[in-house]
């Protein structure tokens, strides 16, 4: 912490300007009035403060706003945002997309994924839902950031907004997030024709249930392997060899090079070796011919 001293009269600060870069840490602490700093935050980013000096300025704002900064200050944080922790950001109430854009720009190229995720969360809370303007801002200024939101936050996305989401925005989404987004996407694209529907729904398929995957296998969609491997394991395991062949079309030969990865590996183990042989890939590990498959879960349910 910065030690308290009194400000020498000749060092008194009446406005935030470039002269402050020559102030030592303790002089900044003693001479800069927190209210003045807050009122003139828009000037701070134009001044080449050192990281140590920025620490002092942050400390002053923290003292002035212990419950969290007002948006008028947040909007003009500039490089001071780099000093914020997720705990700091959690106290904020942000509703303006201009604020979001400004801070996303500042964070680019810095390791700030936790801070950015918290900021986006605060924006969604502040605006009440993940509306189209927010999604557009995220896709433009922070590709992939959509996936930093929790499934609970994503549940506030109206289906009408799903069309604004691009495939690359979903690259880092996990299964729980796709579970939330997939039904919305299905609803949003339901009036599209077969091939157009598949192109649109493809990035969301990691949240699709088995019955929807089986339905796709009847539609000549030629699903690529990367999409197939993002499907839920539970959605893939019940598929037959014939269904997977129909689903993947020409991409089915790629099963050979990905046979060690889930869900491909787990699926192979559940297929009859005879059926796997029809794929012409030399896949091994299926159930040998002549073996009976006992589903013990059914027997337990009956007893």
């Amino acid at each position: 912490d910065v030690e308290r001293t009194t400000c020498p009269p000749e060092k008194e600060v009446h406005e935030i300007d470039e002269s402050l870069i020559f102030y030592k840490k303790r002089e900044l602490e003693a001479c800069v009035d927190a209210a003045l700093l807050a009122a003139q935050m828009d000037r701070v980013d134009a001044i080449p403060f050192t990281y140590e000096q920025l620490d002092v300025l942050k400390h002053k704002l923290d003292e002035l706003y212990p419950q969290g900064y007002p948006e008028s200050v947040i909007r003009h944080l500039g490089h001071l945002f780099l000093k914020m922790s997720p705990e700091d950001i959690r106290k904020w109430n942000v509703t303006s997309l201009e604020t979001l854009k400004a801070l996303l720009k500042v964070s680019k190229g810095h390791e700030m994924s936790a801070q950015v995720a918290t900021l986006i969360d605060r924006v969604v809370v502040g605006r009440g839902q993940l509306d189209k303007d927010t999604v557009d801002t995220l896709t433009a200024f922070c590709p992939g950031c959509l996936c930093s939101l929790s499934p609970e936050r994503l549940s506030s996305v109206p289906p009408s907004v799903i069309g604004a989401v691009r495939p690359q925005d979903l690259d880092t989404c996990g299964p729980r997030q796709l579970d939330v987004l997939y039904p919305k996407a299905r609803l949003a694209f339901q009036n599209m024709s077969g091939s157009e529907y598949f192109v649109k729904i493809r990035p969301f398929l990691g949240g699709a249930p088995t019955e929807d995957v089986k339905a796709l296998s009847q539609q000549n969609v030629s699903m690529d392997l990367a999409t197939f491997m993002k499907l839920r394991r539970e959605a893939v395991l019940p598929l037959t060899v014939a269904e997977v062949q129909k689903l993947l079309g020409p991409h089915v030969e790629g099963l050979k090079v990905e046979e060690q990865h889930s869900p491909v590996r787990d699926w192979i183990l559940k297929q009859r070796q005879d059926d796997l042989d029809t794929l012409g890939l030399g896949l091994q590990g299926g159930i040998p011919n002549g073996y009976l498959i006992l589903d013990l879960s059914v027997r337990e349910a009956l007893s």
Epitope: Q168, M229, H251, G254, V257, E258, G280
Partner: antibody, heavy 117, light 113 residues
Framework: QVQLQQPGTELVKPGASVKLSCKAS????????MHWVKQRPGQGLEWIGN????????YYNERFMSKAKMTVDKSSSTAYMQLSSLTSEDSAVYYC??????????WGPGTLVTVSA | DIVMTQSPSSLAMSVGQKVTMSCKSS????????????LAWYQQKPGQSPTLLVY???TRESGVPDRFIGGGSGTDFTLTISSVQAEDLADYFC?????????FGGGTNLEIK
Amino acid sequence: QVQLQQPGTELVKPGASVKLSCKASGYTFTNYWMHWVKQRPGQGLEWIGNINPSSGDSYYNERFMSKAKMTVDKSSSTAYMQLSSLTSEDSAVYYCARSGGLWLAFWGPGTLVTVSA
Amino acid sequence: DIVMTQSPSSLAMSVGQKVTMSCKSSQTLLNSVSQNNYLAWYQQKPGQSPTLLVYFASTRESGVPDRFIGGGSGTDFTLTISSVQAEDLADYFCQQHYRTPYTFGGGTNLEIK
């Protein structure tokens, strides 16, 4: 070792058809898919399609859907591609290539098809 | 279709020099589950058929000299020849096998000075 044999040249008349062959040896024919690729003189490579020699299922680049038909004869370990309604645009070298999983691990020497009256 | 763009279209190098050529795809070729990039590099010497050099963007095919090094991920890929030899005179093609129709780049022609 893996070998793919293709005839060197085929001279055909405009409007006619030609059936190109690719005889495989040195590996289990039904364990690897076969691809066909077109290369026009001094130009790049174009993927025509792939075929599963085990089942005969074939898949095409849409651009070649009405131009090419791929088949296999398991008994002779040979892949075929028939090209129909030939024009000067079809004059090119046609390669068969054995898959390595997705990439093309072994290529035949290619057949030069010349369409000329 | 996925568009593959190679650069430069040609280059001339002296024996022993290091050469790097680029291949860019119009969309990602990364399988985020297996972390494999579905990109291959081929060499085509004058009057011959292409041969596989590299698959999965960076895995060298067996028998390929270790001066051939594939790199990159997502949409940007490179093939580097660490010390060019006279026998490397050829066209070099990249190909995506992420989604059909599998597409090739226009090629880079390597001349030896």
